[in-house]
């Protein structure tokens, strides 16, 4: 009976996500058969989040909208480990929007999910950010410094990275 009700709950939860994500890839968390964590197929997973590299070129606003339609946001990077995971799936000759912007052009950077912007956990290329007109952040590769962030014009189309919380069923 208990297993039956758990299965029913899982099915209803899966139906919730079906409109965005017809297919989920789930793994068992720990030793308990009851706990499964899922990411949409073909998203990748790291710790408690799922990531999707969007290769369509769009402005920052459209990229964020594209992520939100999938129940996600443009990526918020919280640690060096998280960035190191993300870059494994990026192409060196491309740039990708992050969920980081300076809406008023005042050098007051903010994350899309309202995570406080912490200057000590940023990975700007040297000399970046450097322009009041460039209000959106990308991650890109520079041969001298490997992967890092740069500020650019928000309306210039780029690829992007979406991030969402893992789905627990």
């Amino acid at each position: 009976n208990f297993m039956y009700s758990k299965t029913v709950k899982r099915l209803s939860k899966l139906r919730e996500y079906q409109q965005y994500h017809p297919s989920l890839t789930c793994v068992m968390e720990g030793k308990d058969i009851e706990d499964w964590s899922c990411c949409p197929t073909p998203w990748t997973s790291f710790q408690s989040s799922c990531y999707f590299i969007s290769t369509g070129m769009q402005s920052w606003t459209k990229s964020q909208k594209n992520c939100s339609v999938m129940g996600a946001d443009l990526v918020v990077i919280n640690t060096r480990e998280e960035q190191d995971f993300i870059i494994q799936n990026l192409k060196r000759n491309s740039s990708y929007f992050l969920g980081l912007s300076d809406p008023g052009g005042r050098r007051h950077w903010q994350w899309v999910d309202q995570t406080p912007y912490n200057e000590n956990v940023t990975f700007w290329h040297s000399g970046e950010p450097n322009n009041l007109d460039e209000r959106c952040a990308i991650i890109n590769f520079r041969s001298s410094e490997e992967w890092g962030w740069n500020d650019i014009h928000c309306h210039v189309p780029q690829k992007s990275i979406c991030k969402m919380k893992k789905i627990y069923i």
Partner: antibody
Framework: QVQLQQSGAELVRPGVSVKISCKGS????????MHWVKQSHAKSLEWIGV????????NYNQKFKGKATMTVDKSSTTAYMELARLTSEDSAIYYC???????????WGQGTSVTVSS | DIQMTQSTSSLSASLGDRVTITCQAS??????LNWYQQKPDGTVKLLIY???NLHTGVPSRFSGSGSGTDYSLTISNLQQEDIATYYC?????????FGGGTKLEIK
């Protein structure tokens, strides 16, 4: 080449307003914000503020809030600054300057002299 | 606001001299220090940005250095056309602020 052409000198009475212009050419106007700078004998150069030619929003030096109003007309690639309720303290040369990388003003207009006198 | 101090308001030098103009910020400005030249006719040009980078078309006799709060502009071989007033400007924090200027004259 990049050019910023400012309007001519103004001689105005105290208490009135004046609007000066700065026409940008030789570059994509909406890719670069426009700064305004005041130069008076007493105070050397003072940054008034900056207006985004793309978004239209502005950042003002607190000191010039209520005194200066910056606007932009994309169709004519012209930035404007209006100075209100003029006093002799506002007599100065006013420059427009294009925003550049590394928090710099990379090209400057020739300056507009504003003289406030009764 | 960040205060920018150019302690020398005027400076006299001979053609061919090496001239150094200094600028001090009231707090660390992370190398966001720019130098401008204003000619006697009022024309203003950017010379150096981000402490040490030469703007397009600026002769190589101009150079910049510094870090933290202390910065300098050097003209290695003074020419007649360098007679002007030189201003430093910090871009680290809004509002941007300028030094009081250093007027360069020929001896």
């Amino acid at each position: 080449q990049v050019q910023l052409q400012q309007s001519g000198a103004e001689l105005v009475r105290p208490g009135v307003s004046v609007k000066i212009s700065c026409k940008g050419s030789g570059y994509t106007f909406t890719d670069y914000s426009m700064h305004w700078v005041k130069q008076s004998h007493a105070k050397s150069l003072e940054w008034i503020g900056v207006i985004s030619t793309y978004y239209g929003d502005s950042n003002y030096n607190q000191k010039f809030k209520g005194k200066a109003t910056m606007t932009v007309d994309k169709s004519s690639t012209t930035a404007y600054m209006e100075l209100a309720r003029l006093t002799s303290e506002d007599s100065a040369i006013y420059y427009c300057a294009r925003n550049g990388n590394f928090y710099v003003m990379d090209y400057w207009g020739q300056g507009t002299s504003v003289t406030v006198s009764s | 606001d960040i205060q920018m101090t150019q302690s020398t308001s005027s400076l006299s030098a001979s053609l061919g001299d090496r001239v150094t103009i200094t600028c001090q910020a009231s707090q660390d400005i992370s190398n966001y220090l720019n130098w401008y030249q204003q000619k006697p006719d009022g024309t203003v040009k950017l010379l150096i940005y981000y402490t040490s980078n030469l703007h397009t078309g600026v002769p190589s006799r101009f150079s910049g250095s510094g870090s933290g709060t202390d910065y300098s502009l050097t003209i290695s071989n003074l020419q007649q056309e360098d007679i002007a007033t030189y201003y430093c400007q910090q871009g680290n924090t809004l509002p941007w602020t300028f030094g009081g200027g250093t007027k360069l004259e020929i001896k």
